[in-house]
């Protein structure tokens, strides 16, 4: 149905209306002035309206809420707490705002929130309890099933302590929010693309046992040595395209081999085809885990550039070649 036009806020709240004892039917649900509302579709869109905060008078029927492209910089605790609560809100899209800070308990009082998108916000301060709601060592489980955090890395000049240290701090901040109090143990989809991640914090994934889909594409991951996928027994899709991976070691390959349903996507990484690649090549030739394995080609050394990994033999893989300086750190 067509979006309802915005109705000016009435001074009488629904609760006050009922208490007045009037027998008149309640008015149609209000729609905030900067939004478009469709009760039939249970959708409210407040898009590109330069909003500085979450509208106060959101209709309680809302199931899908789009608050994209606004000017909100801080999401305070209880930003969506309403009376009556927004009990039916399932999908909340806050992408493309200017959010720098998401406070502890920002999403409290949203018992049905299944999908949250905070992408394209320069988050310098993501509270460890943003998704947990409390600082208990084991908090009540969040209802979240899908968490979309693509491109939430702040620009370099907004990160703490310069570039490398700032990235480590940023990764640690995101990891802390994801593991806090085991709140996200029901999360099945996590997107963390385009965040300049250099490494995966060791225990990032340990607290997310229900994950089926993990998107880490377009980061700067050089190695997966310290990451553990062992606990992700339900993992079906792992996207690692467009990173800086040079080789995969036996420990990682063995973990993937132990995951029953997983598909791993590895295209567009600068594979270094030297003697350290032998285990990975042998594994690739045997595995069904990597759907795009025929697309994987060597980037270095120069004499091997563009050579398909699946065609390599151990005799092709030596460690005599000089690598570019940028590839000599592991």
């Amino acid at each position: 149905s067509a979006p309802s036009s915005s109705v000016p806020s009435s001074s009488t709240s629904p609760a006050a209306f009922l208490a007045s004892g009037s027998a008149q039917p309640p008015p149609a649900e209000r729609c905030p002035a900067a939004c478009e509302c469709s009760e039939a579709a249970r959708t409210v869109k407040c898009v590109n309206r330069n909003l500085l905060e979450v509208p106060a008078d959101l209709p309680p029927y809302v199931r899908n809420l789009f608050l994209t492209g606004n000017q909100m910089t801080v999401l305070p605790a209880g930003a969506f707490a309403r009376q009556p609560p927004l009990a039916d809100l399932e999908a909340l899209n806050l992408s493309g705002n200017h959010l720098k800070e998401v406070c502890a308990g920002a999403f409290e009082h949203l018992p049905g929130l299944r999908r949250l998108d905070l992408s394209h916000n320069p988050l310098t301060n993501l509270s460890a309890f943003a998704f947990a709601g409390s600082n208990a060592s084991v908090s009540a489980p969040s209802p979240l099933e899908e968490l979309i955090l693509n491109h939430i890395v702040p620009p370099e000049d907004q990160r703490q302590n310069g570039s490398f240290e700032g990235m480590v701090a940023f990764e640690g901040m995101v990891a802390a929010a994801l593991r806090s109090g085991l709140a996200l143990r029901g999360l099945t989809r996590l997107e963390l693309a385009s965040n300049h991640f250099l490494f995966l914090p060791r225990d990032l994934l340990a607290q997310l046992p229900s994950l089926r889909y993990l998107d880490l594409r377009n980061n700067s991951l050089v190695s997966l040595t310290y990451a553990s996928f062992r606990n992700l027994t339900h993992l079906e899709s792992l996207h690692l395209e467009d990173n800086a991976l040079k080789v995969l070691h036996n420990s990682t390959l063995a973990e993937w081999h132990g995951l029953a349903h997983v598909k791993v996507f590895l295209d567009n990484n600068p594979w270094v085809c030297d003697c350290y690649m032998a285990d990975m090549v042998a594994w690739l030739k045997e595995t069904e885990v990597v759907p795009d394995k025929a697309r994987l080609t060597c980037a270095f050394p120069e004499k091997m550039r563009n050579r398909g990994l699946l065609d390599l033999n151990s005799s092709d893989l030596d460690c005599d070649a000089v690598l570019p300086q940028s590839l000599q750190t592991s």
Epitope: N218, D242, N268, A294, T297, A299, R305, N306, R307, G308, L310, D311, L312
Partner: antibody, heavy 116, light 107 residues
């Protein structure tokens, strides 16, 4: 050194089919993607698709599915592209190139003219 | 498909000039960009791969730069043998796509 030698120019009638060849020397033929590219005046370069000879894996540009088919004969280090149901739109120069992430060696091109 | 646009279809320059050819992608391509030279006789050569790496045997007067959606090829000191059509090509996503080409001519 790497060389890709393509078959000679062809004049074909509309509705016919034809097969272009590309013979590779100077490298491990099975280990690199072999690309096919179309060049028409006013249209620049268009990627048709690719084949990995050692495995027979192929990727096609959706636009050329049903028009082009790639095969490779590893015994002779030769790749082939079959073009079917030729029309005047298929008149072009067709290149093969050694591929992967970049196309670092190109054949000299085969000119195909489709005319009644 | 990712569209590649070379906004200048042809340009004239003098010997020794610095020539810059631009190329833009319809979405971010993560530096997955190559540059090719097509000579008047139809031969095609790779010049630059992965945005800025000079292919072996290519003169150092050629250089590439860019990021995100915007890329460029620079010829620092134009020589007669540089008369050609220059194409950019993305390899970020299949199908690979080329720009429309920029023809470099002598004044």
């Amino acid at each position: 050194q790497v060389q890709l030698q393509q078959s000679g120019a062809e004049l074909m009638k509309p509705g016919a089919s034809m097969r272009l060849s590309c013979k590779a020397t100077g490298y491990t033929f099975t280990g690199y993607w072999l690309e096919w590219i179309k060049r028409r005046p006013g249209h620049g370069l268009e990627w048709i698709g690719e084949i990995l000879p050692g495995r027979g894996s192929t990727n096609y540009n959706e636009k050329f599915k049903g028009k082009a088919t790639f095969t490779a004969e590893t015994s002779s280090n030769t790749a082939y592209m079959q073009l079917t149901s030729l029309t005047t739109e298929d008149s072009a120069i067709y290149y093969c190139a050694r591929g992967g992430r970049d196309f670092d060696n190109w054949g000299q091109g085969t000119t195909l003219t489709v005319s009644s | 498909d990712i569209q590649m646009t070379q906004s200048t279809s042809s340009l004239s320059a003098s010997l020794g000039d610095r020539v810059t050819i631009s190329c833009s992608a319809s979405q971010g391509i993560n530096n997955h960009l190559n540059w090719y030279q097509q000579k008047p006789d139809g031969t095609v050569k790779l010049l630059i791969y992965y945005t800025s790496s000079l292919h072996s045997g290519v003169p150092s007067r050629f250089s590439g730069s860019g990021s995100g959606t915007d890329y460029s090829l620079t010829i620092s000191n134009l020589e007669p043998e540089d008369i050609a059509i220059y194409y950019c090509q993305q390899f970020s996503k299949l199908p690979y796509t080329f720009g429309g080409g920029t023809k470099v001519e002598m004044k």
